[in-house]
Amino acid sequence: GVAQSPRYKIIEKRQSVAFWCNPISGHATLYWYQQILGQGPKLLIQFQNNGVVDDSQLPKDRFSAERLKGVDSTLKIQPAKLEDSAVYLCASSL
């Protein structure tokens, strides 16, 4: 399955955080979603191999994501705000 780290993270506002994702082996497409409590998941960014397909919902002044060698991916929030409190979901597909 898709592996993510860390499972939980607590930080103070105005600090930074990063999340790591390892997709299912052989999956070319990787997605990062943000799910705020009581809401559905919102797509932040979609990768096809190394390239970004859609990052229109990603606030580029504080969020960034990269996918190295078309495999692992990192999502950064730098710095975070109170309203960034959410579950960050990684998914992959062929």
Epitope: R14, Q15, S16, T74, K76, P79
Partner: antibody
Amino acid sequence: QVQLKQSGPGLLQPSQSLSITCTVSGFSLTNYGVHWVRQSPGKGLEWLGVIWSDGSTDYDTAFISRLSISKDNSKSQVFFKLNSLQADDTAIYYCARRAVVADFDYWGQGTTLTVSS
Amino acid sequence: DIVLTQSPASLAVSLGQKATISCKASKEVTIFGSISALHWYQQKPGQPPKLIYNGAKLESGVSARFSDSGSQNRSPFGNQLSFTLTIAPVEADDAATYYCLQNKEVPFTFGSGTKLEIK
């Protein structure tokens, strides 16, 4: 192409306020934050504050009581106001665009301020 | 606030030799694993600063003569506190002031700067 153009006065007296407008082109203020940095004569760089893409602001602790930053997304303008000027506020003031992936990648040309009576 | 202490304040290096600039953080500036929120800027007189290292990544178009490495000075939790910018071999165009910057926390903070002179 991406540009940040600053306008503002060059000489002010103590206790007056500095107002600078940073007009941007080539990108949208709804996607990027604009930060303000100053450099005093012969000294280093000092981060002053930021207005984020969502319109919220953060200020350096030392300036929180006399600095305000606002913006007009439709006009692509960011407004910087520093009150109660003193001689040691004499500096070059820069606005700069920041995205996480490129940090401060584009800067304004700088506004040189002298505070003198 | 995170304090960045840069050293030396100035240094003079002969053409073709190595320049080493240090930046020490009062708190860790790594975010996760090896992801760094410590950056290096170069500033020449009359110009705004130019990003040369974004975290541990050399900016596109910047000479590979510039390298960044963290020392082994780490906090008890294994986080990196000391960073070094190395330029080798130094060229005449490298004469400038170099600043480290952290953006792990707001307020962002700069180091005090290191002025590099080429002999």
